[in-house]
């Protein structure tokens, strides 16, 4: 289904406007901000979600060491330009003609420049490391149980194929989820790891993007898993290009 037919809503994206104006009176949903039609049977792209968010009213040891090329989204929110497929355009600019290049998850990967800045291609983020710290519990979670439940979560809630969940590491209280998806691995219809990570990030923050579903309630053998902080690192297929000035700052 493209949307819930009964009341014409989008189960996977509450930041939409839906109406029965599709072919044969079918429910069709469009993302806020961009007005682009979205497929409500899967996750909406991060670019369209960010655009919708910006248009909405403002009140509404076994652990992996991130590589030196890992990016963290320090720039926060911006109103992105999305291509006709809903992906980030390689070059993003703000209203004051400051431009920069982004990767496939919309995170800046170059220094900021002016309108003459060129971004030849959209560089794919092929490895995402989600670093979580859980609240204290009576004892540590069983690593195997934790792996099983986090895989189930990504599979069931975000429809991410298990082969893209490369690993779940655990050293109490730190959990690391590694998502990997090369361009060659991603088939038509596969959820993008960047979109899954964004939905997960919003769920963890208590800002679920799903329509009408309760927030994320994750339990491992009945024990609630409550996250108190999240850090997400992004690794691109081509390392980012920042000046030494930024790296030493």
């Amino acid at each position: 289904h493209t949307a819930a037919q009964d009341n014409c809503t989008c189960p996977t994206n509450k930041m939409t406007v839906c109406s029965p104006d599709g072919p044969g009176g079918r429910c069709q949903c469009r993302a806020l901000g961009s007005g682009m039609a979205v497929d409500c049977s899967t996750l909406t792209s991060k670019c369209l979600l960010l655009k919708a968010r910006m248009s909405a009213p403002k009140n509404a040891r076994t652990l992996v060491r991130p590589s030196e090329h890992a990016l963290v989204d320090n720039d926060g929110l911006y109103d992105p330009d999305c291509d006709p497929e809903g992906r980030f355009k390689a070059r993003q600019c703000n209203q004051t003609s400051v431009c920069w290049c982004v990767n496939s998850v919309g995170v800046r990967r170059t220094d900021k420049g002016d309108l003459s800045l060129r971004c030849d291609e959209l560089v794919r983020t092929h490895h995402i490391l989600i670093d979580l710290r859980h609240r204290p519990t009576a004892g540590a979670f069983n690593h195997s149980d934790l792996d099983a439940e986090l895989r189930r979560l990504f599979r069931e809630r975000y429809r991410l194929h298990p082969k893209f969940v490369a690993a779940v590491h655990y050293e109490q209280p730190t959990i690391q989820i590694e998502l990997r998806q090369n361009t060659s691995q991603k088939a038509a219809g596969d959820v993008d790891i960047g979109d899954a990570a964004y939905y997960f990030e919003r769920d963890i923050k208590g800002e679920s993007l799903f329509q009408g579903r309760g927030g994320l309630d994750l339990r491992v053998r009945g024990e609630p898993l409550q996250v108190e902080r999240t850090l997400i690192y992004y690794l691109d297929e081509i390392p980012p290009k920042f000046s030494m000035k930024r790296l030493t700052a």
């Epitope: 792996d147 099983a148 298990p162 690993a167 779940v168």
Partner: antibody, heavy 117, light 111 residues
Framework: QVQLQESGPGLVKPSQTLSLTCTVS?????????WNWIRQPPGKGLEWIGY???????LYNPSLKSRVTISRDTSKNQFSLKLSRVTAADTAVYYC??????????WGQGTLVTVSS | DIQMTQSPSSLSASVGDRVTITCRAS??????????LHWYQQKPGKAPKLLIY???NLESGVPSRFSGKGSGTDFTLTISSLQPEDFATYYC?????????FGQGTKLEIK
């Protein structure tokens, strides 16, 4: 000790809706785990139908998704299966089972449902 | 869907024999930490009973003559010394991907 018990009519007419209930004792279905329905046609293997989670989320087998609804009544500690538009191919022993971390550790004893006019 | 293929489909053996049943998945059912492959025993007119979870973990109360091993796509269930109560049908099940799927079963009969 966790126990599961299926109940419901043993005979359903073709094109009607099969309705079964699983009553759980010894554990609250809203406290954790995943509560499943599995079926087994006479003399055949096992087929997973779907589950409802501790938080009320559903996951169904795509081969049955258009006909299946699994719901729950936490006040009675029960979860239910509805399978619409049944045919003779839906004749089976229906089991409810608890999924711990993706395996089934507790099962009901099963109930045979025959689809026949 | 992941297809689970068990071999043999049926097997005749005697009390005291060592028996091995194989289960092959059409794609890997392992993660870096887990092997999402489980074994059940079913006797006529009864519900299946969990024997082994995650490929090699013995469920509480299951005799130690049962053991499991394997990873990726190939798994085995071994009964080291058959007892009269072991004659039953055995099923493997994967839970790496939904829908969860079972093998077609291996019927273990008395020779």
């Amino acid at each position: 000790q966790v126990q599961l018990q299926e109940s419901g009519p043993g005979l359903v007419k073709p094109s009607q809706t099969l309705s079964l209930t699983c009553t759980v004792s010894g554990y609250s279905i809203s406290s954790g785990y995943y509560w499943n329905w599995i079926r087994q046609p006479p003399g055949k293997g096992l087929e997973w139908i779907g589950y409802i989670s501790y938080s009320g989320r559903n996951l169904y087998n795509p081969s049955l998704k258009s006909r299946v609804t699994i719901s729950r009544d936490t006040s009675k500690n029960q979860f239910s299966l509805k399978l619409s538009r049944v045919t003779a191919a839906d004749t089976a022993v229906y089991y409810c089972a608890r999924d711990t971390t993706a395996y089934f550790d507790y099962w009901g004893q099963g109930t045979l449902v025959t689809v026949s006019s | 869907d992941i297809q689970m293929t068990q071999s043999p489909s049926s097997l005749s053996a005697s009390v005291g024999d060592r028996v091995t049943i194989t289960c092959r998945a059409s794609e890997s059912v392992s993660s870096s930490v887990n092997r999402f492959l489980h074994w059940y025993q079913q006797k006529p007119g009864k519900a299946p009973k969990l024997l082994i979870y995650r490929a090699s973990n013995l469920e509480s109360g299951v005799p130690s003559r049962f053991s499991g091993k394997g990873s990726g796509t190939d798994f085995t269930l071994t009964i080291s010394s058959l007892q009269p109560e072991d004659f039953a049908t055995y099923y493997c099940q994967q839970s790496n991907e939904d829908p969860y799927t079972f093998g077609q079963g291996t019927k273990l009969e008395i020779k």
